[in-house]
């Protein structure tokens, strides 16, 4: 799977995680920090 960094405009998109762009799927994806979940890593679940 080819990945790259998200565009600059997505800098604040992931609240507690890193935004990566999945080139083959044409999708931005939030890779959440441990303890966080949700599309934008907005939920703390511990």
């Amino acid at each position: 799977v080819s990945i790259t960094k998200c565009n600059s405009d997505m800098n604040g998109y992931c609240l507690h995680g890193q935004c990566i762009y999945l080139v083959d799927m044409s999708q931005n994806y939030c890779r959440c920090e441990v303890g966080y979940t949700g599309v934008r890593c907005e939920h703390f679940y511990l």
Partner: antibody, heavy 116, light 106 residues
Framework: QDQLVQSGAEVKKPGASVKVSCKAS????????IQWVRQAPGQGLEWMGR????????KYKEKFEGRVTITADTSTNTAYMELSSLRSEDTAVYYC?????????WGQGTLVTVSS | DIQMTQSPSSLSASVGDRVTITCKAS??????IAWYQQKPGQAPRLLIQ???TLQPGVPSRFSGSGSGTDYTFTISSLQPEDIATYYC????????FGGGTKVEIK
């Protein structure tokens, strides 16, 4: 299926304000950014600004600063664009556009006519 | 703000011709460029995103390329249904559209 349904056409007098709504269904606007784009008759596409409904943060194109206000009501899954001090050059079709995880998905557009 | 200079503003070509449109960004946009097709009275239709990723259902005669500040959109063999206005959009840092290219049949 995902949808962005915009409010109906408006006719306004110069100097007045207009507020266009954009109701989302099939997805949560908190997972997205909502952008606003306009197109005057026979002219090109122009980005106006956007809101992050989760953080309630907005960014505007410089030329619209102070005249446009983009808001979002996450309880009704609806975004709004209000443009004040209308002039004839603001006659255009206004589109809301979802961005975020997937690439842009457009509403059907709202025609705003400014005429005395 | 990033500026997008699109050229030409209009062109006339014959059916079957290769058509090329360019967009130049005022700074590096890291391949975050999309191309839209718009026909009169219709909303814009997304053809390509991330420089060269064709949207589902878009014919393979449409393609895109480029990097840094210079990007190209190509129709390999112009068809009558391709008559429209085409716009580039940079979405690396906020958003800026190019001025558009009106494509007509000769």
């Amino acid at each position: 299926q995902d949808q962005l349904v915009q409010s109906g056409a408006e006719v306004k007098k110069p100097g007045a304000s207009v507020k266009v709504s954009c109701k989302a269904s099939g997805f949560n606007i908190k997972d997205t950014y909502i952008q606003w784009v306009r197109q005057a008759p026979g002219q090109g596409l122009e980005w106006m600004g956007r809101i992050d409904p989760l953080r309630r943060q907005t960014k505007y194109k410089e030329k619209f600063e102070g005249r446009v206000t983009i808001t979002a009501d996450t309880s009704t899954n609806t975004a709004y664009m209000e443009l004040s001090s209308l002039r004839s050059e603001d006659t255009a079709v206004y589109y809301c556009v979802r961005s975020g995880r997937e690439f842009d998905f457009w509403g059907q557009g709202t025609l705003v006519t400014v005429s005395s | 703000d990033i500026q997008m200079t699109q050229s030409p503003s209009s062109l006339s070509a014959s059916v079957g011709d290769r058509v090329t449109i360019t967009c130049k960004a005022s700074q590096d946009i890291h391949k975050y460029i999309a191309w839209y097709q718009q026909k009169p009275g219709q909303a814009p239709r997304l053809l390509i995103q991330y420089t060269s990723t064709l949207q589902p259902g878009v014919p393979s005669r449409f393609s895109g390329s480029g990097s840094g500040t210079d990007y190209t959109f190509t129709i390999s063999s112009l068809q009558p249904e391709d008559i429209a206005t085409y716009y580039c959009l940079q979405y690396d840092n906020l958003r800026t559209f190019g001025g558009g290219t009106k494509v007509e049949i000769k």
